[in-house]
């Protein structure tokens, strides 16, 4: 195929690009370049003839043109104009030509960029900064750097003005960061030296550590507070309401129950002037207490909600151990514990996390455990359960069904038929039934928390005849080698034989044959197109019995390796040549032909008249299976003498 | 080998609409550009515009532009050229034509006569 | 638009003479015309194109030159089968022709 290789694709302006020009057909009268992706004469850049060797320069010629006799074009000192697509259209003979279409584009080289800032010391959640990358320069992609990494998705970031400014809304200390610009086309790459961004903020609400507030009696009590601040912050304690020191720090030895009480921790920002202050509560205990769970939600919803359980009280240098099912905790992606262990965080939670949870605190004599906690999980109704699973039943006999549906609370049922409703009941009952108890028989779950409702709809057949059976099959196009097939028989009955026949005889035995579901269901596995066959199912009981019609199974397959005829691969010059190709194929195949490579007709039969010596060659056949998305070919190599030159040639068709 | 047929002769009432067509074979249809070309009786040829199958896209000369619509249907290989409010200086014949670099092609021609 | 002058409009000759139909751009097209034959009744031919190049098929005895505004066809020796109506086209920008060249026997 005739094709244009750009040489460069992206060209720097000034310099030049090849429109290199691959798979040139041989034997022809001349080619023509335009500018665009057509062949129009207005657009014309250059023709060239090739039997005079002439190049005829058109409409678009600017003088910075070459043409080669290979027919590809070389575009000198390269201008921003030149960039698009370029069209060659090799002549041959009668319209009957090819063309082929490249493109190239072209940039400009680029300079070092810088950042310009419209604020150098923003304050956080009340600044924004915008930084612009200079200079704006035409066709140019301008990319940002934070930190030497590409730019974080946040909806407080946003690029504008072609992605030449970088705009940082409500400042945070987390924007305090080296950033870059960079500008880039396809032919040069230049990045900005950093510029860096210092936000004043803070202080924050201030951290006292250890978090835990529960002491032994005897131990020192040791508290560190931390406030994130720019300028750091000054500390100040106060221990129930009255100033202690001036520190971040506050140390008070071998504490006793009398040091129980509030503890506060004060920031102050001497640059904003602004204070944050935080509260802890310190107890003090003379005996470890006996652990209790608490629970952030204690009625979760299947699927949707998470759980976390904590362990009370917060204890210092204790270890924290929990239970599910009276068990140690399995190994699960659902579950999650806090890094001290006194938090367990249940993900999505299922029915099947109900529990009993029970969490225990370990000292140096014994573990003490919580009460257990039973998580209530709401979920459902799931789709009902009809049972017996039955869809025909005799007269005179007693209907009893059943309906179940997994719900938490329990499901409130509704029984229909025929879309009226019956009864609020989990059990329908119908003794001596009728011909006139046929129906669609549905049951309705309801779950009175979630509000949600599930329905499954029965058909229910009253006959003393046994109906005639039908066959549901789960793949009509089977592919031959590949697909297997299941045939049902519908419908399925109470006290009921069911049987099978392929052409009217009974099964035949075969590993590839399976019967299952009480022989309700024949699976024909990997089939072939010799199971294209009927198969009829049938059903009896005590009183009657029926058959179903015919079902033709259409296995599709192929193409086969194609033959050609006549065999004949000799023939003499001034013969007719007819070869027609046969393929096995479900459905029929396409047909096309190739003589030494070159495409012919999409046909059957290949009919050439009076042929000579230069139709001598391979002649190949394809086919195609557009259903089964396979093909095949087959290659024939013909021999044409001249008249009378070799004896025993045949004639041709 | 490479042919455009055009449809029949027409005789129209000036004010009227025509509408002519070039069905096109012998070659790839969605390649070229095809031409409008028309002659007055005795007079010589005027270039009325151009389509291009492919996409549609059309150029006019700008003395019909408003006047003239050139449409194709790819399906049958068939360009149209329509002249509205015709008047009796739109007498002419009405060529299609293929007309590029080294090669040309022409259809028979399309007489048009508007007379009332 | 670019509008092509022909001159002159008709001219009577004789089988063998030497003649020449001369073409005028109104502004510069560079060589990008064509060469044009039409006989009564008949669809145009095209004959010459770049200005200079003859068709594959067509007689040597037509041959074109010139570039810019202005353009010559010229035929070396008539022949019969040339006495038919001449046309000029520019394909620089869209396309004009010129108003014909009627070529008649003497």
């Known amino acids: 195929k005739l094709t244009i290789e750009s040489t460069p694709f992206n060209v720097a302006e000034g310099k030049e690009v090849l429109l290199l020009v691959h798979n040139l057909p041989q034997h022809l009268f001349g080619y023509s370049w335009y500018k665009g992706e057509r062949v129009d004469g207005n657009r014309q850049i250059i023709g060239y003839v090739i039997g005079t060797q002439q190049a005829t320069p058109g409409p678009a010629y600017s003088g910075r043109e070459i043409i080669y006799p290979n027919a590809s074009l070389l575009i000198q000192n390269i201008i921003q104009n030149d960039t698009g697509f370029y069209t060659l259209h090799v002549i041959k003979s009668d319209l009957v030509n090819e063309e082929a279409t490249g493109q190239f584009r072209v940039y400009p080289e680029l300079p070092k960029p810088s950042i310009s800032s419209n604020n150098s010391k923003p304050v956080e959640d009340k600044d924004a900064v915008a930084f612009t990358c200079e200079p704006e320069t035409q066709d140019a992609t301008y990319l940002w750097w934070v930190n030497n990494q590409s730019l974080p998705v946040s909806p407080r970031l946003q690029l504008s003005n072609g992605n030449r400014t970088l705009t940082l809304f409500n400042v945070t200390r987390n924007d305090t960061a080296s950033y870059k610009c960079e500008t880039q086309n396809p032919v040069s790459a230049r990045r900005s030296d950093s510029v860096i961004l210092n936000v004043l903020y803070g202080p924050d609400a201030p951290t006292i550590s250890p978090l835990n507030t529960s002491y032994r009696s005897g131990e020192n009590l040791n508290l560190s507070c931390h406030a994130a601040s720019n300028p750091p912050a000054q500390y100040s304690w106060f221990v129930n309401g009255t100033f202690q020191q001036s520190t971040q720090e506050l140390f008070i030895p071998n504490i006793t129950v009398n040091n129980s009480g509030s503890y506060t921790c004060q920031a102050h920002n001497s640059d904003t002037g602004l204070n944050r202050t935080t509260v802890t509560t310190i107890t003090v205990y003379a005996e470890p207490p006996k652990p209790f769970i608490t629970s952030n939600n204690s009625n979760p919803v299947e699927d949707e909600d998470a759980v976390a359980l904590t362990c009370e009280p917060e204890i210092q240098n204790t270890t924290y151990l929990w239970w599910v099912n009276n068990q140690s905790l399995p190994v699960s992606p659902r579950l999650q514990l806090s890094n001290d262990n006194r938090t367990l965080t249940l993900l999505s939670v299922t029915r099947n996390d109900v529990g009993p949870y029970e969490c225990g605190i370990q000292n140096e004599l014994s573990v003490d455990h919580s009460d257990p906690v039973i998580l209530n999980v709401l979920y459902g109704p799931d789709d009902p359960t009809i049972s017996p699973s039955y869809t025909y039943y005799r007269p005179g006999v007693n209907l009893s069904l059943s309906c179940h549906a997994a719900s938490n609370p329990p499901a409130q049922y509704s029984w229909l038929i025929d879309g009226n409703i019956q009864q609020h009941t989990q059990e329908l009952f119908i003794s001596n039934i009728t011909e006139k108890n046929s129906g669609l028989y549905t049951c309705q779950a309801n779950n009175s928390a979630s509000g949600h409702s599930r329905t499954t709809v029965k058909t229910i057949t009253v006959s003393a005849e046994l109906p005639k059976p039908s066959i549901s099959s789960n793949n009509s196009k089977p592919v031959e080698d590949k697909d297997a097939v299941a045939f049902t028989c519908e419908p399925e009955a109470q006290n009921t034989t069911y049987l099978w026949w392929v052409n009217g005889q009974s099964l035949p035995v075969s590993p590839r044959l399976q019967l299952s579901n009480g022989n309700r269901t024949l699976t024909l596995f990997n089939v072939t197109r010799n199971d294209a066959r009927a198969y009829v199912c049938g059903i009896q009981n005590s009183v009657s019995a029926n058959r179903s019609d015919p079902v033709t199974l259409d296995v599709l397959y192929g193409p086969d390796t194609p033959i050609i005829s006549p065999p004949d691969s000799s023939y003499l010059s001034g013969a007719n040549l007819n070869l027609s190709c046969h393929s096995a194929s479900n459905p029929s195949p396409q047909y096309s032909w190739r003589i030494n490579g070159i495409p012919q007709q999409h046909t059957q039969v290949l009919f050439i008249a009076k042929i000579t010596p230069n139709n001598n060659g391979t002649y190949a056949c394809f086919v195609s299976n557009l259903a089964t998305g396979r093909n095949n070919s087959i290659v024939k190599s013909i021999t044409v003498s001249a008249s009378g030159t070799s004896p025993g040639l045949s004639a041709g068709a | 080998q490479v042919q455009l047929v055009q449809s029949g002769a027409e005789v129209k009432k000036p004010g009227a609409s025509v509408k002519v067509s070039c069905k096109a074979s012998?070659?790839?249809?969605?390649?070229?550009?095809m031409h409008w070309v028309r002659q007055a009786p005795g007079q010589g040829l005027e270039w009325m515009g151009r389509?291009?199958?492919?996409?549609?896209?059309?150029n006019y000369n700008q003395k019909f532009k408003g006047r003239v619509t050139m449409t194709v249907d790819t399906s049958t290989s068939t360009v149209y050229m329509e002249l509205s409010s015709l008047r009796s200086e739109d007498t002419a014949v009405y060529y299609c034509?293929?007309?590029?670099?080294?090669?040309?092609?022409w259809g028979q021609g399309t007489l048009v006569t508007v007379s009332s | 638009a670019i509008r092509m002058t022909q001159s002159p409009s008709s001219f009577s000759a004789s089988t063998g003479d030497r003649v020449t139909i001369t073409c005028k751009a109104s502004?510069?097209?560079?060589?990008?015309v064509a060469w044009y034959q039409q006989k009564p009744g008949k669809a145009p031919k095209a004959l010459i194109y770049s200005a200079s190049y003859r068709y594959s098929g067509v007689p040597s005895r037509f041959s074109g030159s010139g570039s810019g505004t202005d353009f010559t066809l010229t035929i070396s020796s008539l022949q019969s089968e040339d006495f038919a109506t001449y046309f000029c086209q520019q394909y620089y920008s869209y396309f004009t022709f010129g108003q014909g060249t009627k070529l008649e026997i003497k």
């Open positions: 034509a293929i007309v590029e670099w080294m090669f040309d092609y």
């Open positions: 502004q510069n097209v560079g060589t990008n």
């Open positions: 389509i291009h199958p492919s996409d549609s896209d059309t």
């Open positions: 012998g070659y790839t249809f969605t390649s070229y550009w």
